[in-house]
Amino acid sequence: TKTESSSRGPYHPSECCFTYTTYKIPRQRIMDYYETNSQCSKPGIVFITKRGHSVCTNPSDKWVQDYIKDMKEN
């Protein structure tokens, strides 16, 4: 699920997640990540794949939390 631009609020431009992927992304395909703006209606972690795709994920998902800890360390 790609991120979507939101023009609402003073933080334009930014990206917000409105839906999350259902599936765990293979770890080796992920290059980077960032958190969406705190003013978005839903929290989100966006993973950037090695092919340049942006994938919205749920910060509550355990795999997302595990991957972030792994990436912070590495």
């Epitope: 765990k24 080796q28 795999w63 991957y67 792994d70």
Partner: antibody
């Protein structure tokens, strides 16, 4: 060639403590892997016990019935252990370790060990 | 927790026949389903993942289908070597991390 091997299975008395070890050959655990312990009582189906993330956090997850009595740990980049306490006859089973290698969006166990037998009897 | 209900518990078919095994999840599992074959004294062997993707080296006589809560494993042109117990499995790493196996189906080849 990648493989998993379980060890530590034994005949023990009720109330005993036992540690099982799962050793990986041909690969080391990474942020792609989740390692699982699954057991199978004689003539019965498969039942999961615990799971550990192969990456830095080493996060652990347990079946609700296993919390407090079973402990999964990553003791090196190629070994995972399962500590079992207060064993009862109901814990008699073959214990398997398995890997979810995380190579696709669809999770599955792509590698299993041959299993180690734990028998609890007085 | 998600419960996987597998039917039938046992099935007997002749060589060359077809076997169909069903697995029903207690909620939508979004095709996060795998099928395994287990023979006595051996660990389970992966057959299918993602509900329909054949694992490497598995004959095309095996096929999987389904979505939502209903999934099926079909074995065509049954061979003696297919005599085994088959399990479905759901895995999630979402708000909970868990896996749930079906109760198993024993396939007897006559």
């Amino acid at each position: 060639c990648q493989s998993l091997e379980e060890s530590g299975g034994d005949l023990v008395k009720p109330g005993a403590f036992l540690t099982l070890t799962c050793t990986a050959s041909g690969f080391s655990f990474s942020g792609s892997d989740y390692m699982w312990w699954v057991r199978q009582a004689p003539g019965k189906g498969l039942e999961w016990i615990a799971c550990i993330y192969g990456g830095y956090s080493g996060s652990t997850y347990y079946a609700s019935w296993a919390k407090g009595r079973f402990t999964i740990s990553k003791t090196s980049s190629t070994t995972v252990t399962l500590q079992m306490t207060r064993l009862t006859a109901a814990d008699t089973a073959i214990y398997f370790c398995a890997r979810d290698g995380g190579v696709t969006h669809f999770s599955h166990f792509d590698l299993w060990g041959q299993g180690t037998l734990v028998t609890v009897s007085s | 927790d998600v419960v996987m209900t597998q039917t039938p518990a046992s099935v007997s078919e002749p060589v060359g026949g077809t076997v169909t095994i069903k697995c029903q999840a207690s909620e939508d599992i979004y095709r996060l389903l795998a099928w395994y074959q287990q023979k006595p004294g051996q660990p389970p062997k992966l057959l299918i993942y993602g509900a329909s993707t054949l694992a490497s080296g598995v004959p095309s006589r095996f096929s999987g289908s389904g979505s939502g809560t209903e999934y099926t494993l079909t074995i065509n042109d049954l061979e003696c070597a297919d005599a085994a117990t088959y399990y479905c499995q759901y895995i999630t790493y979402g708000s909970d991390v868990l896996t749930a196996f079906g109760g198993g189906t024993e396939v007897v080849v006559k």
